[in-house]
Interface confidence: low
């Protein structure tokens, strides 16, 4: 009968360069119990070759010699005694693209050489890109082990070398960046920058890179209050701003973080559970009133902790003036003068454009004050008789502003016309 | 649109060297092989070698291998071949074409750089 | 090295009329994974080369269909059904199946 002699074996495997390949493959030959029994030799050959003089790419005779080009590379795997004839091909190189031939041998019986059912091995460029791998996510000062590897390659042929780059790696030394392994303990300012791990085969011209960019958690390290786009100034965690009474006001709480943190307004200094006055980083008020002096506090909650900023608001007012107003009393003219601010204003009173400062020694005029509420009243009593046409006026004046009034005593007449100029600092 | 560009002409002296550029555009520059050919003046083309930006693998004609050294900068899509220790044998008119992986062949040539090499 | 050979040299046919070019490997040039690398590029005057057929008879988008490649193993044609006047140049044929790849020494096209 006709020997039998099969070859289960791809037609056609392709591989990048650089990587590996496992090219499973059986084989049966006749043979029979009753002969001797020599030693199982197989072989790959190139095609094209003639078995007898050729180098081998892989065999398990030890006393064949082997492609030097592919020494180390391609290897037989599995049992040849279980007709097992695999195929590992690892650091595949583009020369190692062509067709090979396999070849059983055992005693002087068996020699054949399975040329219908050739492998055709096709390496292509290096498209496969390496993986980097890390728990995610990220934490801002949690040292974290970053690997880089390549899908698909092995340890055949020369060493892989690594070299990683990026930002968040300075200053390591250098050695460090040449490891497949890497432990990084990530900043909050290298979130949003690269990390590259490029590999390259040693003596090889086969070089693959990936870029990942980092997303790094970091809590809020710094809280900015912006208001019309201008950051306010911060000292121990608190921020001071003076505020007109009546006037809209709208604050923005900045905390950079990733995620981006919870911002929220509280009224005063809150408990921890305390509900806020705004679930945003937006404070707006749209008229602030004297009531709401004091402060309110901006804080920025994110899973890795929270930071807080209290805003001292100081509500100021410029001076309002009613008066002055003047009769005629027992004791001689009697002019008052009331007025309103935040902070509380200065007044003077002039006669003529003179200032009247404290009492006259020689008791010509006195000068009263009094306070209700939030405004303050203020008397002037000029006694002796006037001379002529004369103009009183009183002023009331803060850091803010001031503002001042006139009354115009004409003499000989019984109504005293009265004006108002506010003047502004 | 797809387009190579070519620099310009050169002259140079015998024993120097000289860098001819091809910038790529209108297409990913690392999913195409970059080849530069040869053609010498009223003759025919001669392949040199290729280069695939997407690895930075080489491949050169055996001939050509201690004459011409390729390289790229991913940055500017463009791939450089250096050519060393010039002879006159070197004035060429020398082209950069692109290769699909699919083996469809040279689809797009730049406009080709000429080469002068003379004292 | 795969050497490829080219004829005729020079091809002086009237318009309209058929163009043959043949060309010839000095070894098989079917790639080992199983395609055969055979290109034909024309090059007019004063231009770049223009692919014009790849992988034997696979005409490139925007060839015109007067322009047909055939053959196997060594023996590869380019054929020109109808000549017009915008198809004078020098022809090649390539082989990419083998390192190094080369291309054949061209055919001229002129117009009687």
């Known amino acids: 009968e006709k020997p039998v002699y099969e070859l289960q074996v791809q037609k056609s495997v392709t591989v990048q360069e650089g990587l590996c390949v496992l090219v499973p493959c059986s084989f049966s030959y006749p043979w029979r119990s009753w002969y001797s029994s020599p030693p199982l030799y197989v072989y790959w050959f190139r095609d094209g070759e003639i078995p007898y003089y050729a180098e081998v790419v892989a065999t398990n005779n030890p006393d064949r010699r082997v492609k030097p080009e592919t020494q180390g590379r391609f290897r037989l795997l599995g049992d040849v005694q279980k007709k097992n004839c695999s195929l590992s091909i690892g650091d595949a190189r583009m020369e190692d693209t062509g067709s090979y031939f396999f070849r059983v041998e055992r005693g002087r019986d068996v020699k054949y050489s399975y040329q219908q059912n050739k492998l055709n091995l096709e390496v292509t460029a290096l498209i496969e890109k390496p993986d980097i791998h890390f728990l995610e996510p990220l934490e801002s000062g949690r040292p974290t082990r970053l690997s880089c590897s390549l899908p698909g390659s092995c340890e055949a042929g020369p060493p892989l070398t690594f070299s990683w780059t990026g930002n968040a790696l300075s200053p390591l030394d250098p050695e460090t960046t040449r490891s497949s392994e890497l432990t990084l303990t990530p900043r909050p300012e290298d979130h949003g920058t690269n990390l590259t791990c490029q590999m390259k085969r040693q003596g090889a011209q086969v070089t693959t890179e990936r870029t990942v960019q980092l997303n790094v958690s970091y809590a809020p390290q710094t809280i900015t209050i912006f208001r019309n786009g201008i950051a306010l100034e911060i000292l121990q965690n608190t921020s001071y701003l003076p505020v007109l009474e009546g006037q809209a006001l709208r604050l923005l709480c900045d905390a950079p973080s990733n995620p981006p943190a919870h911002l929220s307004w509280f009224q005063g200094s809150p408990a921890l559970n305390a509900t806020p006055i705004s679930n945003t980083g937006i404070l707006e008020l749209r008229r602030v009133r004297s009531a709401e002096e004091g402060g309110f506090t901006c804080r920025a909650q994110h899973p890795l902790g929270f930071l807080q900023i209290f805003l001292n608001l100081s509500v100021y007012s410029l001076p309002q003036l009613l008066g002055p107003s003047c009769s005629w009393e027992a004791e001689g003219l009697h002019c008052r003068c009331s007025f309103r601010a935040r902070p509380a204003p200065s007044l003077c009173w002039r006669l003529e454009e003179k200032p009247l400062e404290g009492n006259s020694s020689q008791g010509s005029f006195k000068v009263n004050s009094s306070s209700a509420g939030p405004w303050a009243n203020s008397s002037l009593i000029l006694h002796g008789g006037l001379s002529s046409d004369l103009k009183v006026s009183c002023k009331a004046w803060n850091i803010y502003g001031s503002q001042s009034g006139s009354v115009l005593l004409l003499q000989g007449r019984s109504n005293l016309g009265t004006g108002v100029v506010p003047a502004a600092l | 649109q797809v387009q190579l560009q070519q620099s310009g002409a050169e002259l140079v002296k015998p024993g120097a060297s000289v860098k001819l550029s091809c910038k790529a555009s209108?297409?990913?520059?690392?999913?195409?092989?970059i080849h530069w050919v040869k053609q010498r003046s009223g003759q025919g083309l001669e392949w040199i070698g290729w280069?695939?930006?997407?690895?930075?693998?080489?491949k050169y004609n055996e001939k050509f291998k201690d004459k011409a050294t390729l390289t790229a900068d991913k940055s500017s899509s463009t791939v450089y071949m250096e050519l060393s220790r010039l002879t006159s044998e070197d004035s060429a008119v020398y082209f950069c074409?692109?290769?699909?992986?699919?083996?469809?062949?040279?689809?797009?040539w730049g406009q080709g750089t000429t080469l002068t090499v003379s004292s | 090295d795969v050497l490829m050979t080219q004829t005729p040299l020079s091809l002086l046919v009237s318009l309209g009329d058929q163009a043959s070019i043949s060309c010839r490997s000095s070894?098989?040039?079917?790639?080992?994974?199983?395609?055969?690398?055979l290109e034909w590029y024309l090059q007019k005057p004063g231009q770049s080369p223009k692919l014009l057929i790849y992988?034997?008879?696979i005409r490139f988008s925007g060839v015109p269909d007067r322009f047909s490649g055939s053959g196997s193993g060594t023996d590869f044609t380019l054929k020109i059904s109808r000549v017009e006047a915008e198809d004078l140049g020098v022809y090649y044929c390539?082989?990419?199946?083998?390192?190094?790849?080369?291309f054949g020494g061209g055919t001229k096209l002129e117009i009687k």
């Open positions: 070894q098989s040039i079917v790639h080992s994974n199983g395609n055969t690398y």
């Open positions: 390539f082989q990419g199946s083998h390192v190094p790849w080369t």
């Open positions: 280069f695939y930006p997407g690895s930075g693998s080489i």
């Open positions: 209108g297409y990913t520059f690392t999913e195409y092989t």
């Open positions: 992988k034997v008879s």
């Open positions: 074409a692109r290769q699909e992986e699919g083996g469809i062949g040279f689809d797009y």
